[in-house]
Each structure stands twice: as structure tokens, then as C-alpha cells.
């Protein structure tokens, strides 16, 4: 009876279990009753990082100098290239697809410490009573407006991203 499931590092095809190709190799032809799976090493600047049945290897990531990137770790047939930013620059994401001089703090966050040549911007959440409604690399959280000092009342509460809205006091006639 043909198998319905295969062991680890195998795959099911044409009612039989074939060996997967090891990392660094791609599939050329599936196994048959009489032959083993045929695999071929990935070419230069290509990789596959898992046991697989892929017919094409993946291209190594390109660290584009026009985006401020450089190679941190050269790729192998089993691993992708790892990019990093030129000195003094910072990755925009964990994948490091581009570089910025320093990151900015989003609305709801203020700048705790402005970036230097060696450290990126440090952001902090705006605490109760403070807000930031902009993305900035230098602005701190701003205190909510004090309606009382303007002889006004709070008409709309503030948040970490918005100031309070003040309005006139209701006068009793």
C-alpha cells in the first residue's frame, strides 16, 4: 500500500517517499522506484537554507551602497548575505533593507535622547499629561494645555497623541 506520510527530510510524490535536498542544494529530479532524488549545489551568489524540494535557489541579498548598505556577513550556499549600514547610520528594520541617519519617534512618543554619532535616537512613550502628535528626531513630549490657567474648561480629554481641547465655561444665568 502506498504511503500517505513520509519521514522527516522526505516528501511524498507519485505515491512514494523521496529524500529532500539538503540545505545548499536544489532539486533536479524526483526519486523514482529505482533512483534517488537528484540534487545540485546552488550556484555562486545563491542559497537555500532548509531541507527542500525547490527547483531554484534564492539569490543572495544585495547590500546596495546607494542605500548606505554594506556586507556584514557574506552569504554561503546555505545562508543569505547579511547587510548592515555604513558607520554612523542605522537600519530601518531588522532585515536592514535601507539605512537612515537616525530614527524618529512616532506620534505618542517623545525624544528622550537625540542621536549621536554612535547611538541612535532614544524614544520614550508620552506619560499621562503629555502628548506628541508628530514624528520627530528632536521633539520631546509636550504637556497638555492647562485650560484652568486660561479660565477655560476641558471639553475633550488629551491622549498621548493629542492635546486637550479647551472651551468656555458654562455660565449659569
Amino acid at each position: 500500500e502506498p504511503p500517505t506520510a513520509c519521514r522527516e527530510k522526505q516528501y511524498l510524490i507519485n505515491s512514494q517517499c523521496c529524500s529532500l535536498c539538503q540545505p545548499g542544494q536544489k532539486l533536479v529530479s524526483d526519486c523514482t522506484e529505482f533512483t534517488e532524488t537528484e540534487c545540485l549545489p546552488c550556484g555562486e551568489s545563491e542559497f537555500l537554507d532548509t531541507w527542500n524540494r525547490e527547483t531554484h535557489c534564492h539569490q543572495h541579498k544585495y547590500c546596495d551602497p546607494n542605500l548606505g548598505l554594506r556586507v556584514q556577513q557574506k552569504g554561503t550556499s546555505e545562508t543569505d548575505t547579511i547587510c548592515t549600514c555604513e558607520e554612523g547610520w542605522h537600519c530601518t528594520s531588522e532585515a536592514c533593507e535601507s539605512c537612515v541617519l537616525h530614527r524618529s519617534c512616532s506620534p505618542g512618543f517623545g525624544v528622550k535622547q537625540i542621536a549621536t554619532g554612535v547611538s541612535d535616537t532614544i524614544c520614550e512613550p508620552c506619560p499621562v499629561g503629555f502628548f506628541s502628535n508628530v514624528s520627530s528626531a528632536f521633539e520631546k513630549c509636550h504637556p497638555w494645555t492647562s485650560c484652568e490657567t486660561k479660565d477655560l474648561v476641558v471639553q475633550q480629554a488629551g491622549t498621548n497623541k493629542t492635546d486637550v481641547v479647551c472651551g468656555p465655561q458654562d455660565r449659569l444665568r
Epitope: G68, H102, S104, S136, A137
Partner: nanobody
Framework: EVQLLESGGGLVQPGGSLRLSCAAS???????EMWWVRQAPGKGLERVS?????????YYADSVKGRFTISRDNSKNTLYLQMNSLRAEDTAVYYC?????????WGQGTLVTVSS
């Protein structure tokens, strides 16, 4: 395409003044926080000054406080840096940059040399 074109640099004696300009195009200038950043020969990038989109709030590095003034004219899509009481240590290439400071959007800069 974002373009930032710095100008106004040159050779000036210590104690002298210069006004740098940065002409911006390819984006809505009035929506962006802008910075002046400089790089002295053989040194890293130093954040000099920043201004919010409306031009109402500013930041200055301690090294230039009281001597430099950042401003902007949103109707002309232009950023300025007025530099007074210049010192030898202000010698650098000055760049303007827009949030979020992508490497790909930097101009060529303008060279300021302070020397007697």
C-alpha cells in the same frame, strides 16, 4: 525624486559669518522636520540643528548654541542656517536632511572652511 541642494559655503575668517541655504524639491517641504548635519574632515556626522515643519520649534547642538540660527521659508521650499562667530572647529561639509533621513536622499553638501 527628492532633491536637496545646499549652497552658501565658502572660506571665512574666524569670527566671521555665513548663511547656508538648502533648496528642496520632490516632496512637500512644509510637512517635514528638517536638519542640518555636518561632517568635519576625517570625522563622523554631527547633528547640528533641526526645525519642525511649521518653523516654531528648533534644536541646536551644544557646540553651536547661541551662534547658529536655523530657519525655513515654506513658501520658497528653502531651509537656512545662519552661522555667526565661526570657529576653526566649524570647518566641515554641511548637509541638509529631511526626516526620516534616508541615505539615498542626501545632497552633495556645501563646504565651510574657517581659517585665517
Amino acid at each position: 525624486e527628492v532633491q536637496l541642494l545646499e549652497s552658501g559655503g565658502g572660506l571665512v575668517q574666524p569670527g566671521g559669518s555665513l548663511r547656508l541655504s538648502c533648496a528642496a524639491s520632490g516632496f512637500t517641504f512644509r510637512d517635514y522636520e528638517m536638519w542640518w548635519v555636518r561632517q568635519a574632515p576625517g570625522k563622523g556626522l554631527e547633528r547640528v540643528s533641526a526645525i519642525n515643519p511649521q518653523g516654531t520649534r528648533t534644536y541646536y547642538a551644544d557646540s553651536v548654541k547661541g551662534r547658529f540660527t536655523i530657519s525655513r521659508d515654506n513658501s520658497k521650499n528653502t531651509l537656512y542656517l545662519q552661522m555667526n562667530s565661526l570657529r576653526a572647529e566649524d570647518t566641515a561639509v554641511y548637509y541638509c536632511a529631511k526626516l526620516p533621513f534616508p541615505f539615498s536622499e542626501w545632497g552633495q553638501g556645501t563646504l565651510v572652511t574657517v581659517s585665517s
